[in-house]
Amino acid sequence: MEDEKPKVNPKLYMCVCEGLSCGNEDHCEGQQCFSSLSINDGFHVYQKGCFQVYEQGKMTCKTPPSPGQAVECCQGDWCNRNITAQLPTKGKSFPGTQNFHLE
């Protein structure tokens, strides 16, 4: 099945924004929302935000999770509010990756 082509006037969604690119804003507007987790020197850094450009989101959102980074994307107003990106679980589709639990 072919990728969905961007519409001429793409719908923009309101997204939760948390992270280095957000400045003083707690929200942003874009064609896709995301929630990400990256491992920086062994520390978990969670971010949320939006992709303003369709192609940017398309590339990032299709990247499979790795031991050091995971991104989850969605379309819909505030759809990333309750999404927390997870690194791949041991034994599931991405060998050699880690499992994390919140205690």
């Epitope: 948390e18 992270g19 280095l20 957000c22 987790l37 491992i39 920086n40 020197d41 062994g42 520390f43 978990h44 850094v45 969670y46 031991p67 050091g68 041991k90 050699g96 880690q98 499992n99 994390f100 639990h101 919140l102 205690e103």
Partner: antibody
Framework: EVQLVETGGGLVQPGRSLKLSCVAS????????MYWIRQAPGKGLEWISS????????YYPDSVKGRFAISRDNAENTVYLQMNSLRSEDTATYYC???????????WGQGTLVTVSS | DIQMTQSPSLLSASVGDRVTLSCKAS??????LNWFQQKLGEAPKLLIY???SLQTGIPSRFSGSGSGTDFTLTISSLQPEDVAIYFC????????FGPGTKLELK
């Protein structure tokens, strides 16, 4: 109750090696990243090393890279710090710590003192 | 590397005082900042994580605020047991601690 107990500190001559251990209890050890942080006498804190859950990824600052090595044994609930080519500036109390994914360095051990001196 | 500075380096205050400690980052670290308390002869203890979240079991007189480069730890009513050194810690990139603020009783 989370407990982290460091051992292995002591007096060592410059250029020699020392291996520290940290035994963990009170949580599922294999699910968590672990860390070493040090504090020179009367000084501030310095992050020294991190290790992921299965030991496959390790992280160090430039100050110890190539000299120190972190490892873990999930069967023994233990994280190690192998310190080689020790220098006088490595003299410090070495703390073992754990995070939860959303709370970095939430729990610390009591520390073990390493003194590097001739 | 991101540098962390804390001010003042030494603070004298009286029991019951509202105390404010400052931590500044050399570049944007969003809210990726923790505050630790270290009493003499003890290991550091986590007070605040993610800039403003109170760690479980920590008295509510402690609070944190800030985002980007400027952060504050506030003790609403100083107690004798709060005498300690307070460190901030950033984990946005290349984890680093601030040099600490020593809090003593007047």
């Amino acid at each position: 109750e989370v407990q982290l107990v460091e051992t292995g500190g002591g007096l060592v001559q410059p250029g020699r090696s020392l291996k520290l251990s940290c035994v963990a209890s009170g949580f599922t050890f294999s699910n968590y990243y672990m860390y070493w942080i040090r504090q020179a006498p009367g000084k501030g804190l310095e992050w020294i090393s991190s290790i992921n859950t299965d030991g496959g990824s390790t992280y160090y600052p430039d100050s110890v890279k190539g000299r120190f090595a972190i490892s873990r044994d999930n069967a023994e609930n233990t994280v190690y710090l192998q310190m080689n080519s020790l220098r006088s500036e490595d003299t410090a109390t070495y703390y073992c710590a754990k995070s939860t994914p959303n709370i970095p360095l939430a729990y610390w051990g009591q520390g073990t003192l390493v003194t590097v001196s001739s | 590397d991101i540098q962390m500075t804390q001010s003042p380096s030494l603070l004298s205050a009286s029991v019951g005082d509202r105390v404010t400690l400052s931590c500044k980052a050399s570049q944007n670290i969003y809210k990726y900042l923790n505050w630790f308390q270290q009493k003499l002869g003890e290991a550091p203890k986590l007070l605040i994580y993610y800039s403003n979240s109170l760690q479980t079991g920590i008295p509510s007189r402690f609070s944190g605020s800030g985002s980007g480069t400027d952060f504050t730890l506030t003790i609403s009513s100083l107690q004798p047991e709060d005498v300690a050194i307070y460190f901030c810690f950033q984990y946005s990139s290349g984890p680093t601690f601030g040099p600490g603020t020593k809090l003593e009783l007047k």
